[in-house]
C-alpha cells in the first residue's frame, strides 16, 4: 500500500553464511543500524555463525565476531553452533541477544548441545553469556593420584605405565577432569598440581617423567592427608567431585592415623579408590591379610566398587579399564541414561525479551519435547519436565514436540504478561501454549491451541499484536507455514483474538493464489503503524513464493483486530534480481531514515533489505453548494 518498492536498500552479504536469516532494527543514540544474523558464517576454521551490524543508509556491514566469544571452564565445540539463528532486541536499553542454539560442550565421551546466547550492549560490545541450560559435566572432577614411591615398589616402570594408561582414560580439559599426583614414602611431595596441565597429552608427558623417590617407610595416612588438605586445595575447583586414587604395596607405618585421615576425607566428600599391589608380599611369601584390610579401610564404601588388588606391579595394567570405568560410573549416578534433560536442549533456538529477563526456547530439552527457559538478573527458571505434562502427556513423550521453536508473550488486562510458546511437532499437528512460569520450576498453562493438519508446523511462528497501542494484546497470530493445500506447501496464518481471558479463533489471513510452494507464515512480524492510521500492523513472510524468490504481505490493523486481506504484497522480484527466500525474517519497529515513518527490514538468503515507508495523503472531499 505505502511501502516503496522502487528504491529499496539491498544490503548484500554471504549466501553461504545465510546472511539475512534474522534481521533486527537497532537504535544507538539516534544512529540507526540493522543487526543481521548469519548463522552459517565462518570464523577461522569453524562455521560458528555470526552477527553483523549494517549501517542503514550507506556503508558496509561489520562482523561483530561474536563467534569468537568463548566460555571459560568448558571444553566447548563452536563449529556449527548457528550463532544468529535467533535475535531478540531489548527496546529498553537497545541491547540485544544473539543465540547459538547448537553450541555444544564436551562431557566425557559425549557432546552436549545445550546452546548459549551472547548479550550485546547498545554499542555492539559483548557483555554477557547467557546459557541457562549449561550444567556442570558429570566429569567435572578433581582427581588426585597418591602414589607409594617407597623402596619396596619394584619395578617403578610398571607403576609409571599404569599411571600413563589410567591418565589416557581421563577426560582432561576445562570443565572436565583435572589431575594432580603426589608421591609419598617417608615424606610426601607434589609431582604436579591439579591445575598444572590442561590436556591428556600434557599430563601424560609430565607423568612419564615422575621418578621413584624411595623411602624406608610407607606413610600412607600422611600421603592421603596431604592429598586431602593440600593437593585438592592447590588448583582444586569449587563444586568439582573430589576423587583420590591411592596405590600402595604395603601396610602403612602410620596406620593409627588412618581413622582420623579417612574421617576428614569423608567430611570433604573425597571418593577414594585404593589399589593394593601385592608384589612385595608375594615375593616374600607373606600373608597380606592385614595389608588388604587396611587398603579396604582406605577405599570408600562399598569395597567392591572402590578397592582393587593386583598380584604385582606388572599386573597394574590389568585394572586400568576397570578403574576407569568405576570412576566414570560416578557420571551417571541416579540418572536414567536413556533420557535427556537439558543436555541436548538447543537453548536459544528462539528468544524473546520480557520485562525481567529473556525467554529462551529449548527445542531439544526433555528428549526433544522442548521447553522454555527464562534467564533473569536474579537467576534462571528451568521448568521441570513434569510441569508440561498437562498439555504434553507422557504417552507422546517420544514424539519430539519441539516446544520452544518460537517464544513470545501476550499481555491481558486480567492476567498481565503471559508467555506463549509453539510446539510445531506436537502429535504431528502442532500446538501453542499460553502459560506463566513460577520460581519453583512449575508452570500454569492457561490455554492451548492445536493445529489442524499433520505436518503443517502449526506454532513454528507466533506473534502477538497490540493493535491500538494500549499495552494490552489484541491479536495472536500463529503460523503453520507447511500447511498443505491445493497440492502445495502453501502455509497458513491463524488469527486469535483476545476475549476477556482467552484467545478465540477468528479465521486466517489471506495469501495469494499462486500454484507454487509459498510457506506463507514462515515469519510473522508485528510492526508499528505503517500507514499512519494509528493502528499497528502485521507483515507476513512467504519465502518460497515465486519459485523461492519470496514475498511479504502487509496486513493493516483496524479497531482492535486485523484486516485479513493484505493491503500490499511485495515480491522479491520487484525489488532486485537474484533475491531468494525474501521474507524469511522481518522486523519493523523504527523509523530508519528520519522521515517520521516506520520502515521495514526484511531478510533474504545473503541479503538484508530495507523498505522505506511513504507518507499517506488523506484527502477529505467536501462539497459546498452555492447558493445553498
Amino acid at each position: 500500500f505505502n511501502m516503496d518498492t522502487r528504491k529499496p536498500r539491498v544490503i548484500p552479504g554471504s549466501r553461504t553464511a545465510f546472511f539475512g536469516y534474522t534481521v533486527q532494527q537497532h537504535d544507538i543514540s539516534g544512529n540507526k543500524w540493522l543487526v543481521v544474523g548469519a548463522p552459517l558464517e565462518t570464523n577461522g576454521y569453524q562455521k560458528t555463525g555470526d552477527v553483523y551490524k549494517c549501517p542503514v543508509i550507506h556503508g558496509n556491514c561489520t562482523k561483530l565476531n561474536l563467534g569468537r566469544v568463548t566460555l571459560s571452564n568448558v571444553s566447548e565445540r563452536k563449529d556449527n553452533m548457528r550463532l544468529g539463528l535467533s535475535l531478540a532486541t531489548n527496546p529498553k536499553d537497545n541491547s540485544f541477544l544473539a543465540c547459538s542454539p547448537l553450541w555444544s560442550h564436551e562431557c566425557g565421551s559425549s557432546y552436549y548441545t545445550t546452546g548459549m546466547c551472547s548479550r550485546v550492549n547498545s554499542n555492539f560490545r559483548f557483555s554477557k553469556t547467557v546459557a541457562p541450560a549449561l550444567q556442570r559435566c558429570q566429569t567435572y572432577m578433581d582427581i588426585v593420584i597418591v602414589l607409594d614411591g617407597s623402596n619396596s615398589i619394584y619395578p617403578w616402570v610398571e607403576v609409571q605405565h599404569f599411571l600413563i594408561n589410567i591418565l589416557k582414560k581421563f577426560y582432561i580439559g576445562p570443565g572436565q577432569i583435572q589431575v594432580g599426583v603426589v608421591q609419598y614414602g617417608e615424606d610426601v611431595v607434589h609431582e604436579f598440581h591439579l591445575n598444572d596441565y590442561r590436556s591428556v597429552k600434557d599430563v601424560v608427558e609430565a607423568a612419564s617423567h615422575i621418578e621413584q623417590r624411595g623411602g624406608t617407610e610407607t606413610r600412607t595416612a600422611f600421603g592421603i592427608e596431604f592429598a586431602r588438605s593440600e593437593a585438592f586445595q592447590k588448583g582444586g575447583r569449587k563444586g568439582a567431585k573430589k576423587v583420590m586414587i591411592v596405590i600402595t604395596d604395603g601396610e602403612s607405618h602410620d596406620s593409627p592415623d588412618l581413622e582420623k585421615v579417612i574421617q576428614q576425607s569423608e567430611r570433604d566428600n573425597v571418593t577414594r579408590y585404593a589399589v593394593a599391589v601385592l608384589g612385595y608380599y608375594n615375593r616374600r611369601g607373606i600373608n597380606p591379610e592385614t595389608f588388604l584390610n587396611e587398603i579396604k579401610y582406605i577405599a570408600s564404601d562399598p569395597d567392591d566398587k572402590h578397592f582393587f588388588n593386583v598380584t604385582d606391579e606388572a599386573a597394574l595394567k590389568d585394572i586400568v579399564d576397570a578403574l576407569g570405568d568405576r570412576i566414570f560410573s560416578l557420571e551417571g549416578t541416579n540418572k536414567n541414561e536413556t533420557s535427556f534433560g537439558l543436555e541436548m536442549s538447543q537453548t536459544g533456538f528462539s528468544s524473546h525479551v520480557v520485562e525481567d529477563g529473556v525467554l529462551l526456547g529449548a527445542v531439544g530439552a526433555y528428549d526433544w519435547n522442548g521447553a522454555v527457559l527464562k534467564e533473569t538478573s536474579a537467576g534462571k527458571v528451568i521448568p521441570l519436565r513434569e510441569s508440561y505434562l498437562k498439555e504434553f502427556p507422557e504417552e507422546l513423550k517420544n514424539h519430539g514436540a519441539y516446544l520452544g521453536y518460537t517464544v513470545t508473550s501476550v499481555v491481558s488486562s486480567r492476567q498481565g504478561r503471559v508467555y506463549v510458546a509453539g510446539a510445531p511437532r506436537f502429535n504431528h499437528t502442532g500446538k501453542v501454549i499460553l502459560f506463566t512460569m513460577h520460581n519453583n520450576r512449575s508452570l500454569t498453562i492457561h490455554q492451548a491451541m492445536r493445529g489442524q493438519q499433520i505436518g503443517s508446523y502449526f506454532g513454528s511462528e507466533i506473534t502477538s499484536v497490540d493493535i491500538d497501542g494500549d499495552g494490552v494484546t489484541d491479536v495472536l497470530l500463529v503460523g503453520a507455514p507447511m500447511y498443505f493445500n491445493e497440492g502445495r506447501e502453501r502455509g497458513k496464518v491463524y488469527v486469535y483474538e483476545l476475549r476477556q481471558n482467552l484467545f478465540v479463533y477468528n479465521g486466517t489471513l489471506k495469501d495469494s493464489h499462486s500454484y507454487q510452494n509459498a510457506r506463507f507464515g514462515s515469519s510473522i512480524a508485528s510492526v508499528r503503524d505503517l500507514n499512519q492510521d494509528s493502528y499497528n500492523d502485521v507483515v507476513v513472510g512467504a519465502p518460497l513464493e515465486d519459485n523461492h524468490a519470496g514475498a511479504i504481505y502487509i496486513f493493516h490493523g483496524f479497531r482492535g483486530s486485523i484486516l485479513k486481506t493484505p493491503k500490499q504484497r511485495i515480491t522479491a522480484s520487484e525489488l532486485a534480481t537474484g533475491l531468494q527466500y525474501f521474507g524469511c525474517s522481518i522486523h519493523g519497529q523504527l523509523d530508519l531514515n528520519e522521515d517520521g515513518l516506520i520502515d521495514l527490514a526484511v531478510g533474504a538468503l545473503g541479503n538484508a533489505v530495507i523498505l522505506w515507508s511513504r507518507p499517506v495523503v488523506q484527502i477529505n472531499a467536501s462539497l459546498h453548494f452555492e447558493p445553498s
Epitope: 600422611f222 602403612s252 607405618h253 593409627p256 592415623d257 588412618l258 581413622e259 579417612i262 592385614t290
Partner: antibody, heavy 120, light 109 residues
C-alpha cells in the same frame, strides 16, 4: 639404646596443674607414637592418651578428655602431658611408652614411670 | 569402645605348671593384641605382639594364640621369675586408642 625417661611428677592439690615430660633417646620421636599409661596404687594399667609426633594427631581416654593435653617437640625428641584440673583419682604412676609399626602396634619400650599424687 | 575382659583375675600355680590366661574382646577385633608382664614397682614389659608373635628376648615358654574374639597367653612351664601380673592390650584398628585388660596376678601356690 632405646630409652624413655619420665619426669615432672610430684604432689599437687586438687584443681592444680602439672606437666609431665618424656625424653626419648635411641630413636626419633617422629617415626613413632607416644602413649601415656597410668597405674593407680594397687590397680591395673589404664591408658591415658597418645600422640603421633609426625601428624600431631591425638587421642584421649574419656576420663581425661578436656583436662589433659598431649604434645610433642620433635626437635627435643620429647613428649609432654599437660594435666589440668587434677582430681584425687588422677593419683597414679604415669608411664610413657613407644608404639610403632615395627612392634606391630604394641608398646615395646616403657619409661620407669613418674608418680603423681593429687591430695590436699 | 572395645572392652577386654581378662580372666582369671588371679591364679596360684607352682613352678613347672602350665598356665593359661584368657582375654575376651567385647567385639570382633584385629589381631593387634599384645601381652605384658609387670613386676611390682617396675614398668610393664612386652611379651607377645600381634596375638601370637614372640617379642625378641622373651623366653619361648611364653606363647600367644587367638580363637575368634578370645586371646590366650600360655606359659608352658612356669619359672620362679614368671610370678608377676600379666595384662592383655588391644589396639583399635587405624587409630591409636588402646585398651588394657584388668590384669591377672600369678602367685606362688
Amino acid at each position: 639404646e632405646v630409652q624413655l625417661v619420665e619426669s615432672g611428677g610430684g604432689l599437687v592439690q586438687p584443681g592444680g596443674s602439672l606437666r609431665l615430660s618424656c625424653a626419648a633417646s635411641g630413636f626419633n620421636l617422629d617415626s613413632s607414637y607416644i602413649h601415656w599409661v597410668r597405674q593407680a596404687p594397687g590397680k591395673g594399667l589404664e591408658w591415658v592418651a597418645s600422640i603421633s609426633s609426625y601428624s600431631s594427631y591425638t587421642y584421649y581416654a574419656d576420663s581425661v578428655k578436656g583436662r589433659f593435653t598431649i604434645s610433642a617437640d620433635t626437635s627435643k625428641n620429647t613428649a609432654y602431658l599437660q594435666m589440668n584440673s587434677l582430681r584425687a583419682e588422677d593419683t597414679a604412676v604415669y608411664y610413657c611408652a613407644r608404639y610403632w609399626y615395627y612392634s606391630a602396634w604394641a608398646l615395646d619400650y616403657w619409661g620407669q614411670g613418674t608418680l603423681v599424687t593429687v591430695s590436699s | 569402645d572395645i572392652q577386654m575382659t581378662q580372666s582369671p583375675s588371679s591364679l596360684s600355680a607352682s613352678v613347672g605348671d602350665r598356665v593359661t590366661i584368657t582375654c575376651r574382646a567385647s567385639q570382633s577385633v584385629s589381631s593387634a593384641v599384645a601381652w605384658y608382664q609387670q613386676k611390682p614397682g617396675k614398668a610393664p614389659k612386652l611379651l607377645i605382639y600381634s596375638a601370637s608373635s614372640l617379642y625378641s628376648g622373651v623366653p619361648s615358654r611364653f606363647s600367644g594364640s587367638r580363637s575368634g574374639t578370645d586371646f590366650t597367653l600360655t606359659i608352658s612351664s612356669l619359672q620362679p621369675e614368671d610370678f608377676a601380673t600379666y595384662y592383655c592390650q588391644q589396639s583399635a584398628p587405624y587409630s591409636s586408642l588402646i585398651t588394657f585388660g584388668q590384669g591377672t596376678k600369678v602367685e606362688i601356690k
